[in-house]
């Protein structure tokens, strides 16, 4: 799978959306590696 | 609302080295990777590289590793791409663009900086 | 390097009509593409992510489809604001590419 940092970006703000943003304060795309996903 | 502002344009001599900045505003600057891309008159795009504000990370395109240094001044919100041993072929506009998720999903760009390298 | 290719480079088109710009990949890439649109002096401005997904507040007349090599942005009815040039980017692999962009003129 993608792990640049824009795949990862967007893979993140799906995550987002579909938890309704329901998420750790910390979730952010330069907080997380490519193993989150 | 979301504003990247980057610097004035510059004009350089042939073998000098140019620090161009992005100021971010409007969201968590160390969320987000920051871009830098170049467009040199009737070219196409051109990515030199991201930077992770959080960590100093960076990922560089191999045609410009060795000349160009992404770097960060967290406490300012604002990214600087330095572009070094400066050549004609680097005259081009150079923006930053960043996606950004929170408040508002969408890819930002700065408004350009215009280097001209001229002896 | 993965080289992406857009075609035409230019076209002529009138308002309302339909029009559809390709991209093709030198390798995979997924659906890890991106559609830009720029004006003469201006910053580009984001149209799609994800091959095919909407950023907010584009209009719904732009669409782009495509998975692996082959993408397109398609315009269902141009407008007189959409005159401009596109480009495709590809984010699956360092260096991130872009195409060498479709220039949309008015007929």
């Known amino acids: 799978s993608c792990n640049t940092a824009t795949c990862v970006t967007h893979r993140l703000a799906g995550l987002l959306s579909r938890s309704g943003g329901v998420v750790k304060d910390n979730f952010v795309p330069t907080n997380v590696g490519s193993e989150a996903f | 609302e979301v504003q990247l502002v980057q610097s004035g344009a510059e004009v350089k001599k042939p073998g000098a080295s140019v620090k161009v900045s992005c100021k971010a505003s409007g969201y968590t600057f160390t969320d987000y990777y920051m871009n830098w891309v170049r467009q040199a008159p009737g070219q196409r795009l051109e990515w030199i590289g991201d930077i992770n504000p959080n960590t100093g990370g960076t990922n560089y395109n191999q045609k410009f590793k060795g000349r160009a240094t992404l770097t960060v001044d967290k406490s300012a919100s604002t990214a600087y791409m330095e572009l070094s041993s400066l050549r004609s072929e680097d005259t081009a506009v150079y923006y930053c663009?960043?996606?950004?998720?929170?408040?508002?999903?969408?890819?930002?760009w700065g408004q350009g900086t215009t280097v001209t390298v001229s002896s | 390097d993965i080289q992406m290719t857009q075609s035409p480079s230019s076209l002529s088109a009138s308002v309302g009509d339909r029009v559809t710009i390709t991209c093709k990949a030198s390798?995979?890439?997924?659906?890890?593409v991106a559609w830009f649109q720029q004006k003469p002096g201006k910053s580009p401005k984001a149209l799609i992510y994800s091959a095919s997904y909407r950023y907010s507040g584009v209009p719904s007349r732009f669409s782009g489809s495509g998975s692996g090599t082959d993408f397109t942005l398609t315009i269902s009815s141009l407008q007189p604001e959409d005159f401009a040039t596109y480009y495709c980017?590809?984010?699956?692999?360092?260096?991130?590419?872009f195409g060498g962009g479709t220039k949309v003129e008015i007929k």
């Open positions: 390798q995979n890439v997924d659906t890890n």
């Open positions: 980017q590809q984010y699956n692999n360092y260096p991130y590419t």
């Open positions: 663009a960043s996606i950004i998720i929170v408040p508002n999903y969408f890819d930002y």
